[in-house]
Interface confidence: low
C-alpha cells in the first residue's frame, strides 16, 4: 500500500505542463492519487497521472521518436536526393551534347547525309537516355539499328551517288549487307562494347542512388511498436507523474531503450555499409570505357572513323553489294 | 580532315565562368559524393546513440531518471533501468525487423550484388576481347580504349570537362526542377517535441 500524499501536495506543476500537451485539464488529478489503474508509469507512491494521461504520453513519445528519426536522417536524405537529381540531369546534358557533337560531325563532314543522319542519331541518343533511366532496351540493338539505318544513306549518297532516291527494296538489302559484309569493320562492335559497358555502369549507379533514397524514406517513416511506446513513455514522461519535471533520463538507460526500439532498424546497418563500399568500388571503376561521359562525347569521332573506313573500302564494297543487291536495284530502275 | 565541332556548341554565357579555380567534373562529383556517403557509413548503428544525444538526457546533472525513480547518475541503479516486471527488452529485440525493413534489406542485398558484379576488377579496365577480326591499318588497336574519341585530328579532347556550375546554371532552368514537397496530411494537433 503506497503511503498517502503529504497534506499540501498538489498536481499543479504537472497540470500546467500537461496543458501544453493537451488543452483541457480534466485528465489531471487535483492532488496525487494511488494510480492503481496505470499500466506504464507504475507508481511507487501517490501519482499525478491518470490512465488517459498515460495514453497521451505514449502517443507523444512515439511522435517524438518519429520526429527525431526524421531529423537524424535529414542531411543524409538530402545528400542522396540532391546527388541523384544532379547526376540524372548531368547525364542528360552529356547525352544532349554527344548528340550535338555527332550531328555537327555529319553536318560539317558529310552534309549530303543530313537530315536522315540527324534523324537516326536522334533516335539512337533517345534510346541511350531511356536506357540510362531504366528502360528495357538492348544496347547492341541500339547500335545495330544506328548502323543499319546509316549504311543505306551512306551507300546511296556517298558511295553510289548516281542511284535514284533509295527505295525500300534496296534499303532492306543494304541493311542486311551491312552486317554480312561487316561494312563498318569492327567499329560497330567497338561502339557496342564501349556504350554498353559505360551505360550499364551509369544505369546501376543511378539505380543505387534511388534505392538509397528509398532506404532512408523507409526508415524515416517507421511506426514504432506499442512496446517501444511504453518504454519511451517510461523514460521520457513517467517522471512527471511524480512531479519531477526537470529530471532527465540516465544516459545508459536511454541507450538501452533506444537499442530496444531500434533493434529492427539497426539490422540494416550491415547491408548499408556494404552498399556504400560497393558504390565506392563502382565509382572508382567509372573511367575510360566505363565512363559514359568519356564514351558518349567521343562517339562522334568513332562514328566519323567508321564512315572513313567504309569510304576507304568503297571500291571493293560497291562491287560486292552491286552483285548482292542487284535484284533490288534492277527493280528500282524499272 | 574531321571537323572539330566544339565551338559550335559553346554557350557564350559559359565562357564567362570558364576560369573557375576548381573545375567540377562528373567524376570529381562522384568521388565527392562517395566521400560524403562514407561519413554516414555507421548511420544505422549510430542511430540509437544519435537519438539519445538529441533528446533530453542527463549530462551534467547529478541525478537522473531510470524509468522508476530518481538515482545518482553513476550508480548501479542508473544503468539498471526500471523495466523489471514490465516487458522483456530481449523479447522486443527478438521480434525481428518489421516487414517493411525486411523488404528494404532484400532490396539492398540485391543492389549490392549488382554493384559487385558491375564493379571493374582492379587492373582490368581494358577488355581485350575484340578478336573477331584484325583491324585493318588505320583502325584502332587491340585496346578498345585507344579508340575512345576516335583518331586523327577528329579526336575530340574530351577531358571530363562537364562543368556543373556552368552547365546546371545555364543549361537547366533550376526553377523547373520539381520540388519534393508532396502534400502529406500534417499530424493532427500533436506537439511532437520535448518539454522540460
Amino acid at each position: 500500500q503506497p503511503p498517502p500524499p503529504p497534506p499540501d501536495a498538489t498536481c499543479h506543476q504537472v497540470r500546467s505542463f500537461f496543458q501544453r500537451l493537451q488543452p483541457g485539464l480534466k485528465w489531471v488529478p487535483e492532488t496525487p492519487v494511488p494510480g492503481s489503474d496505470l499500466q506504464v508509469c507504475l507508481p511507487k507512491g501517490p501519482t499525478c497521472c491518470s490512465r488517459k494521461m498515460e495514453e497521451k504520453y505514449q502517443l507523444t513519445a512515439r511522435l517524438n521518436m518519429e520526429q527525431l528519426l526524421q531529423s537524424a536522417s535529414m542531411e543524409l536524405k538530402f545528400l542522396i536526393i540532391q546527388n541523384a537529381a544532379v547526376f540524372q540531369e548531368a547525364f542528360e546534358i552529356v547525352v544532349r551534347h554527344a548528340k550535338n557533337y555527332t550531328n555537327a560531325m555529319f553536318k560539317n563532314n558529310y552534309p549530303s547525309l543530313t537530315p536522315q543522319a540527324f534523324e537516326f542519331v536522334g533516335e539512337f541518343f533517345t534510346d541511350v537516355s531511356l536506357y540510362i533511366l531504366g528502360s528495357d532496351i538492348n544496347v547492341d540493338d541500339m547500335v545495330n539499328e544506328l548502323f543499319d539505318s546509316l549504311f543505306p544513306v551512306i551507300y546511296t549518297q556517298l558511295m553510289n551517288p548516281g542511284l535514284p532516291d533509295s527505295a525500300l527494296d534496296i534499303n532492306e538489302c543494304l541493311r542486311g549487307a551491312r552486317r554480312d559484309l561487316k561494312v563498318f569493320g569492327n567499329f560497330p562492335k567497338l561502339i557496342m562494347t564501349q556504350v554498353s559497358k559505360s551505360l550499364q555502369v551509369t544505369r546501376i549507379f543511378l539505380q543505387a542512388l534511388n534505392l538509397g533514397i528509398e532506404v532512408i524514406n523507409t526508415t524515416d517513416h517507421l511506426k514504432f511498436s506499442k512496446d517501444c511506446g511504453r518504454m519511451l513513455t517510461r523514460m521520457w514522461y513517467c517522471s512527471y507523474c511524480q512531479g519531477l519535471m526537470m529530471v532527465k533520463p540516465c544516459g545508459g538507460y536511454c541507450n538501452v531503450v533506444m537499442q530496444g526500439c531500434m533493434a529492427g532498424v539497426v539490422e540494416i546497418d550491415k547491408y548499408w555499409r556494404e552498399y556504400i563500399l560497393s558504390l565506392e568500388e563502382l565509382v572508382n571503376g567509372m573511367y575510360r570505357i566505363y565512363d559514359m561521359e568519356n564514351v558518349l562525347l567521343g562517339l562522334f569521332s568513332t562514328i566519323h572513323d567508321s564512315i572513313q573506313y567504309v569510304q576507304k573500302n568503297a571500291g571493293k564494297l560497291t562491287t560486292t553489294i552491286g552483285k548482292l543487291c542487284a535484284h533490288s536495284q534492277q527493280r528500282q530502275y524499272r | 580532315s574531321a571537323y572539330y565541332p566544339e565551338d559550335l556548341f559553346i554557350d557564350k554565357k559559359v565562357l564567362k565562368v570558364a576560369h573557375v579555380e576548381h573545375e567540377e567534373t562528373l567524376s570529381s562529383r562522384r568521388r565527392e559524393l562517395i566521400q560524403k556517403l562514407k561519413s554516414f557509413i555507421s548511420f544505422y548503428s549510430a542511430l540509437p546513440g544519435y537519438i539519445c544525444s538529441h533528446s533530453p538526457v542527463a549530462e551534467n546533472d547529478t541525478l537522473c531518471w531510470n524509468g522508476q525513480e530518481l538515482v545518482e547518475r553513476y550508480s548501479q541503479k542508473a544503468a539498471r533501468n526500471g523495466m523489471k516486471n514490465q516487458f522483456n527488452l530481449h523479447e522486443l529485440k527478438m521480434k525481428g525487423p518489421e516487414p517493411v525493413v525486411s523488404q528494404i534489406i532484400d532490396k539492398l542485398k540485391h543492389i549490392n550484388q549488382l554493384l559487385r558484379t558491375m564493379s571493374v576488377p582492379k587492373g582490368r579496365v581494358l577488355d581485350k576481347n575484340l578478336d573477331e577480326e584484325g583491324f585493318e591499318s588505320g583502325d584502332c588497336g587491340d585496346d578498345e580504349d585507344e579508340c575512345i574519341g576516335g583518331s586523327g585530328d577528329g579526336m575530340m579532347k574530351v577531358k571530363n570537362q562537364l562543368r556543373f556550375l556552368a552547365e546546371l546554371a545555364y543549361d537547366l532552368d533550376v526553377d523547373d526542377v520539381p520540388g519534393n514537397n508532396q502534400q502529406a496530411t500534417p499530424k493532427d494537433n500533436e506537439i511532437s517535441t520535448f518539454h522540460n
Epitope: 535529414m74 536526393i81 540532391q82 537529381a85 | 554516414f40 546513440g49 520540388g179 519534393n180 514537397n181
Partner: nanobody, 123 residues
Framework: QVQLVESGGGLVRPGGSLRVSCAAS????????MAWYRQAPGEQRESVAA???????IYIDAVQGRFTMSRDNAKNTVYLQMNNLKPEDTAVYYC?????????????????WGQGTQVTVSS
C-alpha cells in the same frame, strides 16, 4: 565575414501566415543546401525544412503541406513561407547550411548561426 540575418517573424493568430527571410552576406549560399531550424523555449533546436542547390525541398512531417521553403540565388536569400500556423510552431527560427551536419553532434558549425527571428502563434 559570413553573416546570416533572419527577418520577417512576428505575432500571428492560429491559422495565419508569415514569410520569414534569411539574407546571407560574405558567402554565396547558392552552392549550399540551406535549412531552416527552430528552437522553442527550453527545447532542442530542430531542423524544419531544407532546400537543395537544385531547388528541391523537404520538410519534417509536422510542417509538411503547411510550410514552403524557397531560395533566390540572385538575392543570396532563402525564405520560409508558413501557412496555417499552429501554436506549436511558436519558436525562434534560424537558417543555416545543411551541408556540415554530422551524425552524433548536437549542433554543427555550418555558416555560423544568426540571431534568429521570433515567430509567435497565439490567439
Amino acid at each position: 565575414q559570413v553573416q546570416l540575418v533572419e527577418s520577417g517573424g512576428g505575432l500571428v493568430r492560429p491559422g495565419g501566415s508569415l514569410r520569414v527571410s534569411c539574407a546571407a552576406s560574405g558567402v554565396d549560399i547558392s552552392t549550399y543546401t540551406m535549412a531552416w531550424y527552430r528552437q522553442a523555449p527550453g527545447e532542442q533546436r530542430e531542423s524544419v525544412a531544407a532546400i537543395s542547390t537544385t531547388g528541391r525541398s523537404i520538410y519534417i512531417d509536422a510542417v509538411q503541406g503547411r510550410f514552403t521553403m524557397s531560395r533566390d540565388n540572385a538575392k543570396n536569400t532563402v525564405y520560409l513561407q508558413m501557412n496555417n500556423l499552429k501554436p506549436e510552431d511558436t519558436a525562434v527560427y534560424y537558417c543555416n547550411s545543411a551541408d556540415d551536419l554530422k551524425i552524433g553532434t548536437q549542433y554543427f558549425k555550418g555558416l555560423g548561426w544568426g540571431q534568429g527571428t521570433q515567430v509567435t502563434v497565439s490567439s
